[in-house]
Amino acid sequence: APVRSLNCTLRDSQQKSLVMSGPYELKALHLQGQDMEQQVVFSMSFVQGEESNDKIPVALGLKEKNLYLSCVLKDDKPTLQLESVDPKNYPKKKMEKRFVFNKIEINNKLEFESAQFPNWYISTSQAENMPVFLGGTKGGQDITDFTMQFVSS
């Protein structure tokens, strides 16, 4: 059965937008006016995952690209990457765990916790134009809260 997906954009809690930075990286920066068209549109897919009260398992693909955010160990550290997949097979209901994020939503603020690495979150830096990364701290300097805007399908 096809997985259900919605198109959206994400901004961090400082209102920085996410844009492509090279073929396999995202960065966060403030955009205005026509530059807003640069922001990446995600296809958020509602996938199978471990049962939990306040967490909704999702996969985050780049709309109309065969790229998904995934979490892997690099040099023994949980790392966020954009991974290329076979578009004939993705998205699917049972995504591999590295592609799955637990969406935690409180008062329209969203966090994305790695299913593969609990307590590691999609994060941005306070600084402008820095890569989006997987961070192991919440409530510190780095930003783990996002807002979501729907995009017409």
Epitope: A1, L6, N7, C8, Q48, E51, K93, F150, S152, S153
Partner: antibody, heavy 120, light 107 residues
């Protein structure tokens, strides 16, 4: 508090169309699917389709495709379900309900229902 | 389409009885299953979502369980206001489908 208020009962002739409205209040209209479900007299519930006003995404039950049109007006927080080529077996109570965009809490609030009677 | 069977279609019970209603599906569904209560002439009322989570304000005598293809609604001690028709619904896959209903009547 959350409310879904539907338009009043309708009597329609076979072959005609009916448009039922569902006005939402007490929540962020954009972020919830509006579901349309019908119930024929003495029968069970049947899902017709849904719309997410924030994105304009619409999903229909194939059984009704081509006969049903679901729309939403964000400016008035109102969703609409239009059913065309009516026949006697379309006589039913039509309900709207809402569901969060991520499907988490199911059909958590319902309208009061709109009785549509199709009779010559 | 996902086929489903809700059973029993009706049952007679007394106040204080434990009542169990089941829904069986033709294939695995994920967590997207809810239970409703409907009284004559009224809109359905949500009781349980995501298989086992109780809607705010619903008494704890209602509970849901199950996984895969088999799901259950249990009323631990039937109260006079619980006499109604109960439906399950899967919203895991299009088209969303409702069970045929279980009418709980007074014995």
């Amino acid at each position: 508090q959350v409310q879904l208020v539907q338009s009043g009962a309708e009597v329609k002739k076979p072959g005609s169309s009916v448009k039922v409205s569902c006005k939402a209040s007490g929540y962020t209209f954009d972020r919830y699917w509006i579901e349309w479900v019908r119930q024929a007299p003495g029968q069970g519930l049947e899902w017709m389709g849904e719309i997410l006003p924030g994105s304009g995404t619409i999903n229909y039950n194939e059984k009704f495709k081509g006969r049903v049109t679901i729309t939403a007006d964000k400016s008035t927080s109102t969703a609409y379900m239009e059913l065309s080529s009516l026949r006697s077996e379309d006589t039913a109570v039509y309900y709207c309900a809402r569901m969060y965009y991520d499907y988490d809490q199911g059909f958590d609030n319902w309208g009061q229902g709109t009785l549509v009677t199709v009779s010559s | 389409d996902i086929q489903m069977t809700q059973s029993p279609s009706s049952l007679s019970a007394s106040v204080g009885d434990r009542v169990t209603i089941t829904c069986k599906f033709s294939q695995d569904i994920d967590r997207f299953l809810s239970w409703f209560q409907q009284k004559p002439g009224k809109a359905p009322k949500s009781l349980i979502y995501r298989v086992k989570r109780l809607v705010d304000g619903v008494p704890s005598r209602f509970s849901g369980s199950g996984s895969g293809t088999d799901f259950t609604l249990t009323i631990s001690s039937l109260q006079p206001e619980d006499f109604a028709t109960y439906y399950c619904v899967q919203y895991d896959e299009f088209p969303y489908t409702f069970g045929g209903g279980t009418k709980v009547e007074i014995k």
